[in-house]
């Protein structure tokens, strides 16, 4: 491992469309990957009215967008759908939503996902 | 160096049957997720259908689905495409394809098959 | 299924120029889309992929951006080996779709 860095071996799964997607609804995946390559969890969700809907969790690929990311955050303002990515052992547990605004201080959005 | 080899192609009677096969090597190939990807001549990539790295899921285009079976031997590395009850919409070079996890794009292709259906 | 409608299909470029091509999803794909280029006779090759991630080995003078629902591929500089079919995909949904392509062909 290199120093400073925490390592992505394992993500945490969920699919809202498991079922016609033929996989497991939720659980623990192991990342894969080339041995020169970093890996990283990741969290797609929905903001339904107010209400929270995971879409995906799981893990990613080798992403400067994620490097040295132990929380998993989304900051673009009011995508369609969010998405985060982070490195570390199920660091996509717990995803958050901080909005890069130029004007405004950015309010923190923590949201803890509990799968139906 | 990762290398996906494509074979079994060739000319077919609409209704006829064939097995396309794709040998994999330079990677541990059940960590991935692989894919069958078709053109046809001079239109674009159509996605046909992709399998977990397990073998446990499979998945298929609404255009296949109930003909084409995929399937995989991982003691093997290779993977397989059952075509049955063919049609002459089916002409295309078949790739097969490489995924990672289920997200991810496909990284490696083979150089291609040509099925042909045509009485 | 998710639909990628890819625009323009054909365009006529010099060397040199920057080149713009877009792709729509029929719905939200978040970061889930990957670009493709295509030469006669070949397998396609992995690009960008996450939208704006460079694959392995590729010039750094191919970006990708976009989010949501509309996606870019830019070709800041072309050259002569850049002439080729580009595709988009999204692999969002298990059932992968492609977007039709769009030929870069020289002026």
């Known amino acids: 491992a290199i120093l400073g860095r925490s390592e992505t071996q394992e993500c945490l799964f969920f699919n809202a469309n498991w079922e016609k997607d033929r996989t497991n609804q939720t659980g623990v995946e192991p990342c894969y990957g080339d041995k020169d390559k970093r890996r990283h969890c990741f969290a797609t969700w929905k903001n339904i009215s107010g209400s929270i809907e995971i879409v995906k969790q799981g893990c990613w690929l080798d992403d400067i967008n994620c490097y040295d990311r132990t929380d998993c955050v989304e900051k673009k303002d009011s995508p369609e759908v969010y998405f985060c990515c982070c490195e570390g052992n199920m660091c996509n547990e717990k995803f958050s939503y901080f909005p890069e605004m130029e004007v405004t201080q950015p309010t923190s959005n923590p949201v803890t996902p509990k799968p139906p | 160096e990762v290398q996906l080899l494509e074979s079994g192609g060739g000319l077919v009677q609409p209704g006829g049957s064939l097995r396309l096969y794709c040998a994999a090597s330079?990677?541990?190939?059940?960590?991935?997720?692989m894919s069958w990807v078709r053109q046809a001549p001079g239109k674009g990539l159509e996605w046909v259908s992709a399998?977990?790295?397990?073998?446990?899921?499979?998945y298929y285009a609404d255009s296949v689905k109930g003909r084409f079976t995929i399937s995989r031997d991982n003691s093997k590395n290779t993977l397989y495409l059952q075509m049955n009850s063919l049609r002459a919409e089916d002409t295309a070079v078949y790739y097969c394809?490489?995924?990672?996890?289920?997200?991810?794009?496909?990284?490696?292709w083979g150089q291609g098959t040509l099925v042909t259906v045509s009485s | 299924d998710i639909q990628m409608t890819q625009s323009p299909s054909s365009l006529s470029a010099s060397v040199g120029d920057r080149v713009t091509i877009t792709c729509r999803a029929s719905?939200?794909?978040?970061?889930?889309l990957n670009w493709y280029q295509q030469k006669p006779g070949k397998a396609p090759k992995l690009l960008i992929y996450?939208?704006?991630v460079l694959q392995s080995g590729v010039p750094s003078r191919f970006s990708g951006s976009g989010s949501g629902t509309d996606f870019t591929l830019t070709i800041s500089s072309l050259q002569p080996e850049d002439f080729a079919t580009y595709y988009c995909?999204?692999?969002?949904?298990?059932?992968?779709?492609f977007g039709g392509g769009t030929k870069v062909e020289i002026k």
């Open positions: 399998i977990s790295g397990s073998g446990d899921d499979t």
């Open positions: 996450g939208v704006s």
């Open positions: 995909q999204q692999s969002f949904s298990s059932l992968f779709t």
């Open positions: 719905q939200g794909i978040s970061r889930f």
């Open positions: 394809a490489r995924q990672l996890i289920p997200p991810a794009p496909l990284d490696y």
């Open positions: 330079g990677f541990t190939f059940g960590a991935y997720a």
